[in-house]
């Protein structure tokens, strides 16, 4: 025999108090699948948590973090403090990146500058706490007599249009 509750769609619950008819989820609750015997309470985004998506009868609310914080954990269950660019969050708070490392975001860890010489290149722009180094042409390309400029295209004879 088929369970009468299996006919109840998302956004409703199978109400045992009313002969197992499908009743809509009450305010501030939802059911994301059919055949539910109860609706789940909507998540409330309070304090540091801001509402990114309102709760509906078929889906939970989604939260993100207020400026100065960023989401951590499944479904943004926590908000971690931002640092400034050029810093990382340690057990003692936000600390500047050590020399030779950088962080171009407000979260995450300081990463080592790119080692240009590993690719046979030279440093074009030095790195900072906030920015990685910019690698340029290889030192061989910069040796005297060598040109890093692309040779110009051959000039056309005047009066001749391209074929």
């Amino acid at each position: 025999l088929q369970d009468p509750c299996s006919n109840c769609p998302a956004g409703t619950f199978c109400d045992n108090n009313r002969n197992q008819i499908c009743s809509p989820c009450p305010p501030n609750s939802f059911s994301s699948a059919g055949g539910q015997r109860t609706c789940d309470i909507c998540r409330q985004c309070k304090g540091v948590f801001r509402t990114r998506k309102e709760c509906s009868s078929t889906s939970n609310a989604e939260c993100d973090c207020t400026p100065g914080f960023h989401c951590l954990g499944a479904g943004c269950s926590m908000c971690e403090q931002d640092c400034k660019q050029g810093q990382e969050l340690t057990k003692k708070g936000c600390k500047d990146c050590c020399f030779g490392t950088f962080n171009d975001q407000k979260r995450g860890i300081c990463r080592p500058w790119t080692n240009c010489s590993l690719d046979g290149k030279s440093v074009l722009v030095n790195g900072t706490k906030e920015r990685d180094v910019v690698c340029g042409p290889s030192p061989a390309d910069l040796s005297p007599g060598a040109s890093s400029v692309t040779p110009p295209a051959p000039a056309r004879e005047p009066g001749h249009s391209p074929q």
Epitope: V48, G68, F69, L72, G93
Partner: nanobody, 124 residues
Framework: QVQLVESGGGLVQPGGSLRLSCSAS????????MSWVRQAPGKGLEWVSD????????FYEDSVKGRFTISRDNAKNTLYLQMNSLRAEDTAVYYC?????????????????WGQGTLVTVSA
């Protein structure tokens, strides 16, 4: 071991003020966000306020905004809740709670340590 001990509760008339304190020990207080949570008689737990580790970011339940002020003294390892313009509906046991990760604010379900609570009664 982590210990949180609240004090400062009592009987106060409507419109009056109280200042709750929460003395913390057993962890690096200055690295953790802290919260106040309350439980009115016969009701569930209700989040009241959060403060981040450094004290520069504070957050409040709508019903207490403008009346309650959360603060902390990291040198004294103490959390405070200044409660002004108290109402009968503020009657509850007030708990302080610690957040589980450094420099992170969690939801109430994830707080890892709670005090034993202090009772605030607002009545004429």
């Amino acid at each position: 071991q982590v210990q949180l001990v609240e004090s400062g509760g009592g009987l106060v008339q409507p419109g009056g003020s109280l200042r709750l304190s929460c003395s913390a020990s057993g962890f690096t207080f200055s690295s953790y966000a802290m919260s106040w949570v309350r439980q009115a008689p016969g009701k569930g737990l209700e989040w009241v306020s959060d403060i981040n580790s450094g004290g520069e970011s504070t957050f409040y339940e709508d019903s207490v905004k403008g009346r309650f002020t959360i603060s902390r003294d990291n040198a004294k390892n103490t959390l405070y809740l200044q409660m002004n313009s108290l109402r009968a509906e503020d009657t509850a046991v007030y708990y302080c709670a610690k957040h589980p990760l450094t420099y992170t604010i969690a939801t109430m379900n994830d707080y890892d340590y709670w005090g034993q609570g202090t009772l605030v009664t607002v009545s004429a």
